[in-house]
Interface confidence: low
């Protein structure tokens, strides 16, 4: 059929609940490109009718919820002008038996349900939800060991919980909760994640690499959008936030009410040694209040910035 | 709106069976926790019996393990609790409840209850 296969990716899901896995892969998608999802090499796509249990939503392949008999190799084909690209996913769903401990927990966990604390720091964990702008997540709630976490401790913030000075003790199960509506139902999303401790810093006390941007400047014009990448390397034990601030506040709360600067859901492509994370930040339209700002991108304790600039004046025009 | 049903009460021998049924109308999403408590008069409201919305988990209360099992249907839409070997301490109205968490304590029989939505009850009265 002329596509070229990218690449398979294996997800281990729990039954019962909501998933969500959007096609993308830059730089393929970034154009003019239409996506379509498929189950199972079936030449028939999945429904695009939002009513339906599983059905497409733009990029995404969304199951409300998640089911048994959903296990399955789906494929989503990536079509531009002259070019067919496939991205396999390889879905296992299984029945997660929360609260009872005589039942083993999730099998083959992946990265984002194992997380590191180090001891005697301020650490955090994150909860995984990625989800179309279809789904509206409600606030998420901690437990451990299926008790709600409370302390002075713990704090929620976004999707992640903040824990101060860690201690042996935090180590254990762990779920993330959030109640996600999607065409006026509701459904609970629930993340379970393993927690270990580590007296390590991290890889050798390594930080984290920004690969880009590189503290300069980007030329752009007035009104036009622009979408800029984070590209950071991590240690894959690693439990640092990576954000975009400007005059030290995140942009999504620094433009709050216009929402006219957003940080977009960060991704990351896993790599035998490390981690390499993107988080992107969309200027829906530049306004001459951005020029000269540094809008910066946070890794844990390192920070890259952007300064937009006026594109200089092209005298060639007069 | 929600609503929560439940039927199958009614007067019944030491050693009997009854069958409780609880019928729920008006979700708006996907329960993921149901069950079944009790309440004697001037006693604690307790915990029976729970099941998990994927059907597979299922908590107990000591005092009925052996004699009551919860179950649905295919919709996930009716929950059942099989009453056998009835006592006379069994004697309480039963309500359904259902809630959007198969976390938190209330599944698994913990004393705060934090389900969403319960019906009004039924009476089972064992006595001869």
């Known amino acids: 059929d002329g596509c070229k296969d990218i690449f398979m990716k294996n997800e281990i899901l729990s039954a019962s609940q909501p998933f969500a896995f959007n096609c993308t892969f830059p730089p393929i998608t970034s154009g003019e490109v239409s996506v379509t999802w498929y189950k199972n090499s079936s030449k028939i796509p999945v429904s695009k009718i939002i009513q339906s249990r599983i059905h497409q939503d733009e990029t995404w392949i969304l199951f409300l919820p998640m089911e048994w008999g959903d296990s399955g190799v789906y494929q989503c084909v990536i079509k531009g002008r002259d070019s067919c690209h496939r991205i396999h996913v390889n879905l296992t769903v299984f029945e997660k038996h929360w609260c009872d401990t005589s039942i083993g927990g999730l099998p083959n966990l992946s990265d984002e349900y194992k997380q590191i604390l180090h001891l005697g720091k301020d650490d955090s964990l994150t909860c995984h939800l990625h989800f179309p702008k279809s789904c509206v997540l409600g606030p998420i709630k901690w437990y451990k060991d299926c008790n709600e976490i409370k302390g002075e401790r713990f704090t929620v913030l976004e999707t992640r919980l903040l824990v101060s000075n860690v201690s042996a003790e935090d180590r254990g199960n762990y779920a993330c909760q959030a109640i996600l509506t999607h065409s006026g139902k509701q459904y609970e999303v629930l993340n379970g994640i393993t927690v270990s401790i580590t007296e390590r810093a991290g890889y050798g006390g390594s930080v984290p690499k920004i690969i880009y941007p590189k503290n300069h400047s980007i030329e752009v014009q007035l009104g036009t959008t622009l979408i800029v990448d984070c590209n950071v390397t991590d240690t894959k034990d690693n439990t640092n936030l990576r954000c975009w601030r400007v005059n030290n506040t995140l942009v999504d709360d620094y433009y709050d009410e216009s929402k006219r600067i957003r940080e977009g859901v960060e991704t990351h492509v896993s790599f035998r040694e490390h981690n390499l994370y993107t988080v992107n930040i969309t200027f829906l339209e530049v306004k001459m209040e951005d020029y000269g700002l540094p809008f910066m991108c946070h890794a844990g304790v390192s920070t890259a910035y952007i300064i937009l600039q006026l594109p200089a004046p092209d005298f060639r025009a007069y | 709106d929600v609503q929560l049903v439940e039927s199958g009460g009614g007067l019944v021998q030491p050693g009997g069976s009854l069958r409780l049924s609880c019928a729920a109308s008006g979700y708006s999403y996907r329960t993921q926790c149901l069950g079944w408590y009790r309440q004697a008069p001037g006693k604690q409201l307790e915990a029976v019996a729970t099941?998990?919305?994927?059907?597979?988990?299922?908590y107990y209360s000591d005092s009925v393990k052996g004699r009551f099992t919860i179950s649905q249907d295919n919709a996930k839409t009716t929950v059942y609790l099989q009453m056998n070997s009835l006592r006379a301490e069994d004697t309480a109205v039963y309500y359904c409840?259902?809630?959007?968490?198969?976390?938190?304590?209330?599944?698994?029989?913990?004393?705060?209850?934090?389900?969403?939505?319960s019906g009004q009850g039924t009476l089972v009265t064992v006595s001869s």
């Open positions: 409840a259902a809630g959007l968490s198969v976390l938190g304590s209330w599944c698994h029989g913990g004393s705060s209850y934090e389900y969403t939505y």
């Open positions: 099941i998990s919305g994927g059907g597979t988990s299922t």
